[in-house]
Interface confidence: low
């Protein structure tokens, strides 16, 4: 497994990570930590593991957290109700 660095699919990353689009270069994907409490997230980034190619630069939230809307277009990993 690729613990850090370039990847194509989640299976190439270590535990607690997913293969997300790089913030800096949209054409590449890098192993990225799963969303922690308070991290920004996208509500549809839920598939873990995901067998295709992710389109967002955020990973799903860690287990026990949910990606919840806090304002019009802002979503954050928060404790599940």
């Amino acid at each position: 497994a690729v613990i850090t660095g370039a990847c194509d699919k989640d299976s190439q990353c270590g535990g607690g990570m997913c293969c997300a689009v790089s913030i800096w270069v949209k054409s590449i994907r890098i192993c990225t930590p799963m969303g922690k409490l308070g991290d920004s997230c996208h509500p549809l980034t839920r598939k873990v593991p995901f067998f295709g190619r992710r389109m967002h630069h955020t990973c799903p939230c860690l287990p026990g957290l949910a990606c919840l809307r806090t304002s019009f277009n802002r979503f954050i990993c928060l404790a599940q109700k």
Epitope: K26, H42, P43, L44, T45, R46, K47, V48, P49, F50, F51, G52, R53, R54, M55, H56, H57, N73
Partner: antibody, heavy 121, light 111 residues
């Protein structure tokens, strides 16, 4: 060749439940999510929910919350939709549809042939 | 829920002419530079068929006379040269926020 084969038409009484099956073949079943969509006679499309065929995680349209259950049987590569407390407005063709794995751009690339569920007293 | 409104409800176009279908979302379906909009074609008695995903990506095997464009709340499906086999109902669908919602459909016929 990817195929989704659904169970046959059903006629149910109001208040009853129905369970529709969708047997997948021609691909690795657990690598793709499965959606369910319905279409009332002469009407448009309505998304019901989807399931991860890998871990069974579900997301439902809140409109159906409490009445709908989507499950999978990995051993037979089959997805199921169960809808309870049926009413006349649930009369529709119910489709299963595979998610195409386009990242988070959910898109349904293969569809079952549809199952007509008629709710009538 | 995000409401998708298509226009027109029906459209009659001559063979070989351009057909344009519009879809307006009640709020933006963009995120991080991508537009989360799909287009499907449905012929009578058949299930829908995916044409375009993520606003402008042509599904494999779909003729290149079909194209999708737009961002934010306004999207367009264009058939550059209508063929007889394109007679169908076309649906847009947003997939930016669940529940994933469809437009009411646009029926395309031959003039």
């Amino acid at each position: 060749e990817v195929q989704l084969v659904q169970s046959g038409a059903e006629v149910k009484k109001p208040g009853a439940s129905v369970k529709v099956s969708c047997k997948a073949s021609g691909y690795s079943f657990t690598d793709y999510d499965m959606h369910w969509v319905r279409q009332a006679p002469g009407q448009g499309l309505e998304w019901i929910g989807y399931i991860s065929c890998y871990n069974g995680a579900t997301t439902y349209n809140q409109k159906f919350k409490g009445r709908v259950t989507i499950t999978v049987d990995k051993s037979t590569s089959t997805a199921y939709l169960e809808l309870s407390s049926l009413r006349s407005e649930d009369t529709a063709v119910y489709y299963c549809a595979r998610d195409g794995n386009y990242g988070e751009a959910y898109a349904m690339d293969y569809w079952g042939q549809g199952t007509l569920v008629t709710v009538s007293s | 829920d995000i409401v998708m409104t298509q226009s027109p409800d029906s459209l009659a176009v001559s063979l070989g002419e351009r057909a344009t279908i519009n879809c307006k979302a009640s709020q933006s379906v963009d995120y991080d530079g991508d537009s989360y909009m799909n287009w499907y074609q449905q012929k009578p008695g058949q299930p829908p068929k995916l044409l375009i995903y993520a606003a402008s990506n042509l599904e494999s095997g779909v003729p290149d006379r079909f194209s999708g464009s737009g961002s934010g709340t306004d999207f367009t499906l264009t058939i550059s040269s209508l063929q007889a086999e394109d007679v169908a109902v076309y649906y847009c669908q947003q997939i930016n926020e669940d529940p994933f919602t469809f437009g009411q459909g646009t029926k395309v016929e031959i003039k």
